[in-house]
């Protein structure tokens, strides 16, 4: 069938349409375009003959269109009137007549429009505003972007008049924001510049920072005011309802307890002619006097006696507060505070409260220190300590003995040998010693103050011949490539050598092995299961060689990745299967099996009879050693073939 | 299920031996160390010592060693204690119990336990 | 031999009360640790072993924890079925040893 299509349909003025035939019949004779609906000789644009190739102009030609051989029309240079329909007649050969009817519709191009406004300076919460977008265009589509957005939904946004009016309602400061409209027609679309929208509102409530309201005297008061408002406000400060300045800030140096009041701010707006007021009470403190701290004994005795601190001097309704060694004050059943807080007891000193101790008085605006106080807690003397540590000395060396014992005031000492008072010092120093200096020596200390005493005694063995020394350890079982060992030959001996063994040989030269302390030390650093040893440390010196029993290391190590035997991997259904797992460990490892991710037993063979293809799978064995804190495991694939089908092997 | 089931009540003279016996089933008996425990009337649990019932090792607490005797029949599934040179404080109830596993493992099924009274 | 040392040696409580057993090793046995629950006429049952494992069966209101020397055995919410004896026992080598025993009663 004959149709006529319009490219495009909607078509600008200015711009070209193509009339588009479809279906064109065969042995034309020729054809004739019409404008209208049908075909009216009075109305035609132009006819074509197809034996001549000759076009002829009708009444209604402008000189603006083309017809093509395939009756194709072009109008160009489209104007307003050329909207509507266009009939085709198409005259066959054989004279019969065929007729088909196309049509477009031609829209102006639009000009950019414009926003136009009844109320350039709207007053929140007072004023509507009516924005119109200019010029009134016929069929042409009105839109409205705020912000570059699409309008929001709100009951205070109201278009009119098809669109082309938005009217925003009570304005609020919120609706300072970019407006723009835009016009739209099937054939283009324009948006205006941005008009911005500037809504005059406040001056809301003024807040006066800082919210400080206490101030001590001699301070400067520095206050500021503000308010939003459009346009910016104008500030007045007035104290106790005097007016004092037309500032946003206000500021009065050194200020004295007469400073106190109310100190109000007023913002006021010219263009909505609002006042608002705000009012801050300020308080101003007389300087409070420092506080100091007394004691009802200024030299206790250690666990004995008791110290009261009270905080001076007694102000009615004042927050004390105190501090020991600049922290506050630990929980302690021994601390005690009275219910105003300004006594602090301490029951049954310690040496450690000795402090430093200070008081505070807290009053609105600060908290005032006192100097700090030290207690002169008596104490001690502790068990004295005999130096040097040395309990073998050989015939003919000075014996040089040193004694301390912690105390408050410093001890007194006195030596006693085998019990016989020998000197009030706190070293004895005996020249050129024989065996008959051998003995038990003590040493007395005592404090003077306390009344109390402690003795140390220490026996002294003077022989050519040294003892059977021992050796000690600062780690029994130390872990594999993690700890270190310390060995120590004891005792400790003047004028002595040491010497030590490792399985009855001297020491390998290792960077893991260390001598230290004059030998007398021995450090395994990061020990491994092959320093699991017998070590035998000896003395000598030039009279008499010892040495020690043995001290075996028992390291800790593993689990190393286990192994599961036997190493077979494929059997034979019937046959029984026994995995045995094993893994180098000290202490020995707890052992755990799994069958494909099921746990099973925790022992150390695992034995299934008469297996079969259902028992094809993954058997882990897991290894934990909780000494070591480490954990390993092996994962063999079982396969079980029916009796016959392979050459796997059985157990 | 696994169980182990022990031999009866004794009643012994001082000086000489009992022999407890614990029968176990529900498990492979080779696969678990067997402990004994005694409880004096009144009193907490004493370890005795532990047989590996594979290899037949034991190993004995020092204050049992050469007076206790611990020996496995594997084809009865079978663990014995004896006890010798038996005296008053003897006088226990003796579990035997199961390790969970091998090797550093705590005991998790025991036997009903066996009354055993020495007196004169 | 490794001494074990249990506290309290008896203890009475309330049904839903928490109760705490607490364990000591004379020497650090890591975590090589078990309970155990004695009733009245009853062989032992294992609780927990490894310290902390709690055995398959055991209900969850028992728990363990600790390591080195000092373990504990707490109930979050105590039954009238867990009157008993518990007993901690290390499975640190040989001689195993056992505490002396806890007896847990109902006020």
């Known amino acids: 069938k004959l149709t006529i299509e319009s490219t495009p349909f909607n078509v600008a003025e200015g711009k070209e349409v193509l009339l588009l035939v479809h279906n064109l019949p065969q042995h034309l004779f020729g054809y004739s375009w019409y404008k209208g609906e049908r075909v009216d000789g009075n109305r035609q644009i132009i006819g074509y003959v197809i034996g001549t190739q000759q076009a002829t102009p009708g009444p209604a030609y402008s000189g603006r269109e083309i017809i093509y051989p395939n009756a194709s029309l072009l109008i160009q240079n489209i104007i307003q009137n050329d909207t509507g329909f266009y009939t085709l007649h198409v005259i066959k050969s054989d004279l019969v007549n065929e007729e088909a009817t196309g049509q477009f519709r031609v829209y102006p191009e639009l000009p950019k429009p414009s926003i136009s406004s009844n109320n350039s300076k709207p007053v929140e919460d007072k004023d509507a505003v009516a924005f119109t977008c200019e010029p009134e265009t016929q069929d042409a589509t009105y839109l409205w972007w705020v912000n570059n957005q699409s309008l929001p939904v709100s009951p205070r946004l109201q278009l009119s008049n098809g669109n082309r009016t938005l009217t925003l309602f009570n304005v609020t400061r919120n609706d300072t924001a970019s407006y723009k409209c835009e016009t739209q027609n099937p054939v283009s679309a324009r948006r205006s510049d941005s008009v911005i929208l500037n809504v005059l509102y406040g001056p809301d409530a003024p807040t006066i920072s800082p919210l400080n309201t206490s101030y001590r005297s001699g301070e400067n008061l520095n206050l500021s005011c503000h308010a939003a408002s459009n346009p910016p406000a104008q500030y007045s400060w007035f104290v106790n309802g005097t007016f004092q300045q037309s500032t946003q800030e206000l500021f009065i140096p050194n200020i004295t307890v007469n400073n106190s009041g109310s100190y109000t701010c007023q913002a006021h707006n010219s263009d909505t002619g609002l006042n608002r007021t705000t009012v801050t009470t300020i308080t101003v403190y007389a300087e409070p006097p420092k506080p100091f701290i007394t004691s009802n004994n200024s030299n206790p005795v250690e666990d004995e006696d008791a110290v009261a601190l009270t905080c001076e001097p007694e102000i009615q309704n004042t927050t004390y507060l105190w501090w020991v060694n600049n922290q506050s004050l630990p929980v302690s059943p021994r601390l005690q505070l009275s219910n105003d807080n300004r006594t602090l007891t301490l029951l049954s000193v310690t040496r450690n409260d000795v402090g430093p101790y200070e008081c505070g008085i807290q009053n609105e605006l600060s908290v005032d220190h006192s100097d700090p106080v030290i207690l002169n807690v008596l104490y001690g003397p502790d068990d004295p300590t005999i130096s040097p540590s040395y309990t073998y000395y050989r015939p003919g060396v000075n014996l040089s003995l040193s004694c301390h014992a912690a105390s408050n005031p410093p001890a007194q000492y006195s030596w006693l040998i085998d019990g016989n008072i020998q000197q009030h010092t706190q070293e004895l120093f005996i020249s050129n010693i024989t065996e008959k200096n051998s003995g038990l020596y003590t040493c007395q200390a005592n404090n003077s103050a306390s009344g109390h005493s402690r003795t140390t005694v220490k026996t002294i063995t003077v022989s050519a011949e040294l003892p059977k020394p021992s050796i000690s350890s600062n780690n029994s079982k130390p872990v594999e490539d993690k700890d270190a060992v310390a060995f120590t030959c004891e005792p400790e001996a003047q004028n002595t050598t040491y010497l030590w063994w490792v399985n009855g040989q001297s020491l390998p030269v290792s960077p893991r092995l260390q001598l230290s302390n004059g030998n007398r030390t021995l450090t395994l650093f990061n020990v491994t299961r092959n320093d699991a040893r017998a070590y035998v440390c000896g003395i000598q010196n030039s009279v008499s060689a010892n040495r020690s029993d043995p001290v075996t290391l028992d390291v800790l190590y593993g689990p190393d990745t286990p192994i599961i035997s036997p190493p077979d991997s494929s059997y034979l259904s019937g046959a029984n299967l026994n995995l045995s797992c094993h893994s180098a460990s000290n202490p020995s490892p707890q052992y755990s099996w799994r069958i494909n991710g099921i746990p099973q037993q925790h022992t150390q063979v695992l034995f299934i009879a008469k297996i079969t293809p259902n028992n094809n799978g993954t058997y882990a064995c897991f290894v934990s050693n909780l000494a070591t804190g480490r954990n390993n495991s092996i994962v063999k694939s079982i396969t079980v073939s029916a009796s016959g089908t392979s050459p796997g092997l059985s157990a | 299920q696994v169980q182990l089931v022990q031999s009866g009540a004794e009643v012994k003279k001082p000086g000489a031996s009992v022999k407890v016996s614990c029968k176990a089933s529900?498990?492979?008996?080779?696969?678990?160390?067997l402990h004994w425990v005694r409880q004096a009337p009144g009193q907490g649990l004493e370890w005795i010592g532990y047989?590996?019932?594979?290899?037949?090792?034991?190993n004995y607490s020092q204050k049992f060693q050469g007076r206790a005797t611990m020996t496995a029949d594997t084809s009865t599934s079978t663990a014995y204690m004896e006890l010798s040179s038996l005296r008053s404080e003897d006088t226990a109830v003796y579990y035997c119990a199961r390790e969970y596993g091998n090797y550093n493992y705590p005991l998790d099924y025991w036997g009903q336990g066996t009354l055993v009274t020495v007196s004169s | 031999d490794i001494q074990m040392t249990q506290s309290p040696s008896s203890l009475s409580a309330s049904v839903g009360d928490r109760v705490t057993i607490t364990c000591r090793a004379s020497?650090?046995?890591?975590?090589?640790l078990a309970w155990y629950q004695q009733k009245p006429g009853k062989v032992p049952k294992l609780l927990i072993y490894n310290a902390k494992n709690l055995v398959e069966g055991v209900p969850s209101r028992f728990s363990g924890s600790g390591s080195g020397t000092d373990f504990t055995l707490t109930i979050s919410s105590l039954q009238p079925e867990d009157v008993a004896t518990y007993y901690c026992q290390h499975h640190y080598g040989t001689p195993y040893t056992f505490g002396q025993g806890t007896k847990v009663e109902i006020k």
């Open positions: 020497e650090n046995i890591y975590g090589y």
């Open positions: 529900g498990y492979i008996f080779t696969s678990y160390w």
């Open positions: 047989i590996n019932p594979n290899t037949g090792y034991t």
